[in-house]
Each structure stands twice: as structure tokens, then as C-alpha cells.
Amino acid sequence: AWELTILHTNDVHSRLEQTSEDSSKCVNASRCMGGVARLFTKVQQIRRAEPNVLLLDAGDQYQGTIWFTVYKGAEVAHFMNALRYDAMALGNHEFDNGVEGLIEPLLKEAKFPILSANIKAKGPLASQISGLYLPYKVLPVGDEVVGIVGYTSKETPFLSNPGTNLVFEDEITALQPEVDKLKTLNVNKIIALGHSGFEMDKLIAQKVRGVDVVVGGHSNTFLYTGNPPSKEVPAGKYPFIVTSDDGRKVPVVQAYAFGKYLGYLKIEFDERGNVISSHGNPILLNSSIPEDPSIKADINKWRIKLDNYSTQELGKTIVYLDGSSQSCRFRECNMGNLICDAMINNNLRHTDEMFWNHVSMCILNGGGIRSPIDERNNGTITWENLAAVLPFGGTFDLVQLKGSTLKKAFEHSVHRYGQSTGEFLQVGGIHVVYDLSRKPGDRVVKLDVLCTKCRVPSYDPLKMDEVYKVILPNFLANGGDGFQMIKDELLRHDSGDQDINVVSTYISKMKVIYPAVEGRIKFSTGSH
């Protein structure tokens, strides 16, 4: 028997520095977690102790903090090289700055293979990107070889900016011939490494003949065997065992997100490359693991540029940006409108001639808007200003919901109106009218939504049975502020870009902004 140790990360999302337990900015260092310096300590410790070790990343290193905003992926290449990753799969967020924003900082600089079998380049891009990413790679580990085959969510064109010259094929269809090719090369130990979410990971384990292990990402899935060491609730045991269609037991793993854990999976293979046993658990990277001093010094060196960036002007406002709780928790506020407009703008994807865009709607809990911005400071808006408005380090995500769920959400928005509670929704692409004289749960008297399958966008009444795409904070997608119906009833959830980054990009693009209060949210006469 031959034993392989797979160390894995996914959805790190720019958390190069240690973070607080909830993966936001580290405040009390003695209670902080993750970060590449701490990760390196643990990885090196395992490399020294065990003979056959692979360090893999399942995508979405890009996007999530000011590190990515400033360094645009150069930080990913630099620190992944420093940690000596063995391979990485492309995630959807690796395309956030377009294909050029992937090639220049990452693909050209990585000292490790970057993989995806289901992304096919066409047109002029085919030669430009040739050899910079691969469908699979065979890596020597000890005296054996291991094949690693990559995959990426086929929804990427709706979630990011890969352009028109990359085709995202069905994962299973694309993976099978590559795995077959590895078999003909006498590679009998094959890991599928990819970024399509836990459900697809399980399907790959079930359907792709010859895949021995699946290491996934995208859904931020936390798996654990035994008592979990922090706040994350396991979605299943680690590894999650799937019985393949040809009767094999295939371990599937994922390691939550944000570099908080290091996935640790030990696999035992027989001489024919069959998995005999698999066991392990994600390792919580808490403060009991010291940060490696040389990586930490390098982080501090790279940090300097970030501090300078946060005070630079992004754009100007010529109006007061009302982000006060007195406004945003009670009525339409122009800060809410600005943020929602930025959220929609960030999700413009012309992927189908029938649709002017794939999504037109935004909802945003008023309680998530934490500060106004005064225009009397020469109109200047900085990252620092925006960090005061959106201090929680969240993301603006894409969900699919039924109209009936949206209706419940808007009822929840005003079910206890008047108490300055955070659930009052700010909107974009939605016209809502409330009658507060009616009883809670029956206060939405009009709910019109902007069409997407139209050449001239207009507002139509919400249909209860129709499925709509909506952009919202991850906080709401996870049921925050009492929006349990969103969490329970959402049909799809894809994590998006860092909230501040979305707004800062929009302001930089617009240069001068002047959002108004324009009647998106109304109260029927006599009730307000």
C-alpha cells in the first residue's frame, strides 16, 4: 500500500493576512486565524513529517479583500509560489478582471500548474492562452505519479468576466476523456480538483470513471468528522464518501473557505491505484499555530502599498450620500440606491441576445449600511470612506429565488417597521409599495420588478411562480436579519465579489456620482 497526504484549500478569497474567526479583519491578534504565514507553518510541519504530500487549491483565490483590489492577482501568484502549491484549479473569480487579469498576474507568474479540463479557448485567445493552463497534470510524488485533472463551474460566464472566447463545457463530459487519457498514460491515481460546488463534486465522484478522489470548492462546504473546532456547522463527514456508478467508494472533500482551515486527507492506495482507505479532517488554523516569520515579513512588506491605497481618491460625489440609519432603516436612501446600482452594474453580462442582462434586481438590508459620506470634503470618496459604509467584509452574491420567496422577504422587510431594525430593504430594479396600516405579513401592496428578457427594460408585476435572479449581500443569502425564507427557499447561490470592491469599482468607473431618492420604495397614502 502507498499513502498520499492531500492538503487542500479553496475559496481563500484574498485572505492573505490572518482574520477574525468570522473571516473579517483581524482585530485581536491572539484570537485570529488563517493567513498564508500560518498556513505555511502547518504545511511545512506536515511536509517534514510525512513522505508523500500534495498541496492543492480548488480555486477562487481571487477577490475578497483590498489585497486583490490593489495587487490584482500578483499577490496570489507570489504567495502561492512561496507556499509551494503543487496545483490549482481555476475558479470563477479568477476571471473577475477578464482573461488578461488572469494571464498577466497569475498564469504567467505561477510556478505550479493551473488546471481546468472544461474550459476551452477559441478564436485569437486559443493561441494566447495555450499552455498557460492545462486540462490535467501528472505530478511525481515520492516513487509514484499522481494525475490531477481540473474543472471549473460552467456558470462562470454568469458569475464573472471570462469574455466570449472561452467556452465552459459540462464538467462530467469534459473530465471523462481527460481521465481516460491519464489511464492510457498508466496513471492509476487520479484526483479531480475543481471549483463547481459540492453537488457537482459528488456527481463527478459518482459519474467520472477513474477518478479516485474529488477535491472541491465554490460552495464553501465545511465537512468534519467528530466535534467541529469552531463555529462552522458540518454539511457531512470528512471525507464525504460517494459510491460511484461502477461501485467504488470515492472520497469527496472541501475545506470551507477564507483560508480558515487546511484540508487534510490521507489516502491509502493499493498497487493497482485503488483507494483502500481515506481519513482526515480540516485543520483549524488558529493562533495555536504560529505564523511563519519569513512569510509574515513578506506580508508586512506587501502591506505598505495597501495602506497608501486606502486614502487615495476613487471618485467624487456631488451629493450627500445618506447612509444614516435614520434613513436607510426607514425609507429609500440614496446610499442604498448607489450600492444597489453598483451591484447590478457589477453583474452586467450579455450572455444571451434575448436578455439585456441576466439579472436586474438587487436587495440590500438597510442595517448593512453603516455610515453616510459627506460631499463637503471636496466630494472625495476613498476606500477608507467605503470601508466605514460597508465594514463587514461581505460579498454581493447572485441567487435564484421564486417570486413567492421575494414577496415573503419584502413582507419581512416591514413586519416590525418603525423600530430602526436592519431588515428594512433597499432595492434596485424593484418598485415596492407598502401599506403600514395593514397587519404584518400583508403590507406589500405593490411589487414590480424590472424585466430582463426585454430590449427596453420596464417594470412588471412580480409573478409568484417565476424564478428570478437577484443580487444581494451574502449576509441575506445566509438568512441574516431574519431572512430565513431566503436561506431556506433559494434555488441557487453563487458567491460574488467583495462588497467594497463592487462599490469602489463603480465609483471609479462613473468618476462623479449623484444618486437620488427616486421612488423605488413607496408607502401608500395615509399610512406614512
Epitope: 498577466e104 504567467k108 505550479f112 494566447q128 495555450s130
Partner: antibody, heavy 117, light 106 residues
Framework: QVQLVQSGAEVKKPGASVKVSCKAS????????MHWVRQAPGQGLEWIGE????????NYNEKFKSRVTLTRDTSTSTAYMELSSLRSEDTAVYYC??????????WGQGTLVTVSS | DIQMTQSPSSLSASVGDRVTITCKAS??????LSWFQQKPGKSPKLLIY???IWVDGVPSRFSGSGSGQDYTFTISSLQPEDIATYYC????????FGQGTKVEIK
């Protein structure tokens, strides 16, 4: 297939400059960094520097920094290495090489530069 | 600057022999080490990178190993066509070649 074709041999006087070219074909020139390496007669390999053809960014060996200039012409997929203030110890074969995964995969055929009075 | 010390500078072995060349870095180079083969009058050819990863088409008798500061290149069974000079290259921090090892047949 990937090919790096270098300019012909040069004979230069001490104090002069030389400019060696390296024309890339079989791949997209701007997608990979280009290295320059030299080898004096009967000696080992010595790294000179590298250039990112898409943006023109360069990294140099400290030893050559004051005398070497790496440039490129993306319209002709050609990289250039110019070495100034030549001295006899600069007599060497100069190679261009494409960078991949941080190392050098494809190499040009080499250009012999002879510095002699 | 990282220094690379390659040894031996030359060796003579018989066909079928196992040949070993070592490279020692002045500091940990994170396995970012390549091995090249250069035949007389020819350009160098990449054989192995990242300490142990073969380039496609390179015969399996060539192998690399090592980590930290110490690396080894092995020809498991020397063939007449392997007569060449072999160089290591560190690419962890910029680039430094070893001095080379000339391999001859007895």
C-alpha cells in the same frame, strides 16, 4: 511548434555595444516571459535578465544592470538584448529562452558575440 | 544572492552505470530547481523542473529529487547519448545556475 530564432554572430570592439535579437514563433509572444542567458567559451551558464513582453517589465542580474537593456517589439514577436561598454570578458554565446513555471523551457540557438580589439 | 554549488564538476562512468549529480543552494530554494542537459555546440535542454517533475518526452532514466537546500539528479542507467554537461538552476529568487557537471563515458 515553438521556435526562438536568434540573430547572427557579431564581432565588436571593446567599449562598443551589441544588440542581439530573438524572434519567437509557434506561440503567442506576449504570453510568456523571455530570459537572456550567456555562456563564455568553455564556461557555465550565467543568467542576464528577463522581460515580460506584454508590458515590458524587466528583471536584471545585478551584475549586468548598468550595462544591459532588454526590450521587445510585439508587432514582430521579437525580443532584444543590448549590452553596452563591451569588454573582452563579454565574449560569449548569448541565448534567449522562454519562461514557463518560473524556469526556462525553449531556448534559441544562441548568438556568438566576440569582443576583440 | 543565492549561490549554487554543483558537484562533481566532471565524472566518467560506464554505459549502464547509475550517475548522480548534486546541487546545494546557499539557502532554502523551496524545490524551485531545474536540471538542464547541454550537448557540445547545442543549446541547453530542460529535463526536470520543480526538483522532480519530468518534461514531456524526457526518458524515465533521468530523475530529480531533493528539497530545502540539497538536490540530486540521477541517470539510472547511463546511455552513450547522455554524454553532455548538466546544469542545475535555482529559480526561487531570480535565477542562478550551478557550475555544471561534464559527464563522459569511460
Amino acid at each position: 511548434q515553438v521556435q526562438l530564432v536568434q540573430s547572427g554572430a557579431e564581432v565588436k570592439k571593446p567599449g562598443a555595444s551589441v544588440k542581439v535579437s530573438c524572434k519567437a514563433s509557434g506561440y503567442t509572444f506576449t504570453s510568456y516571459w523571455m530570459h537572456w542567458v550567456r555562456q563564455a567559451p568553455g564556461q557555465g551558464l550565467e543568467w542576464i535578465g528577463e522581460i515580460n513582453p506584454s508590458i515590458g517589465r524587466t528583471n536584471y542580474n545585478e551584475k549586468f544592470k548598468s550595462r544591459v537593456t532588454l526590450t521587445r517589439d510585439t508587432s514582430t514577436s521579437t525580443a532584444y538584448m543590448e549590452l553596452s561598454s563591451l569588454r573582452s570578458e563579454d565574449t560569449a554565446v548569448y541565448y534567449c529562452a522562454r519562461r514557463v513555471y518560473g524556469t526556462m523551457d525553449y531556448w534559441g540557438q544562441g548568438t556568438l558575440v566576440t569582443v576583440s580589439s | 544572492d543565492i549561490q549554487m554549488t554543483q558537484s562533481p564538476s566532471s565524472l566518467s562512468a560506464s554505459v549502464g552505470d547509475r550517475v548522480t549529480i548534486t546541487c546545494k543552494a546557499s539557502q532554502d530554494i523551496n524545490s524551485y530547481l531545474s536540471w538542464f542537459q547541454q550537448k557540445p555546440g547545442k543549446s541547453p535542454k530542460l529535463l526536470i523542473y520543480r526538483a522532480n517533475i519530468w518534461v514531456d518526452g524526457v526518458p524515465s532514466r533521468f530523475s530529480g529529487s531533493g528539497s530545502g537546500q540539497d538536490y540530486t539528479f540521477t541517470i539510472s542507467s547511463l546511455q552513450p547519448e547522455d554524454i553532455a554537461t548538466y546544469y542545475c538552476l535555482q529559480y526561487d529568487e531570480l535565477y542562478t545556475f550551478g557550475q555544471g557537471t561534464k559527464v563522459e563515458i569511460k
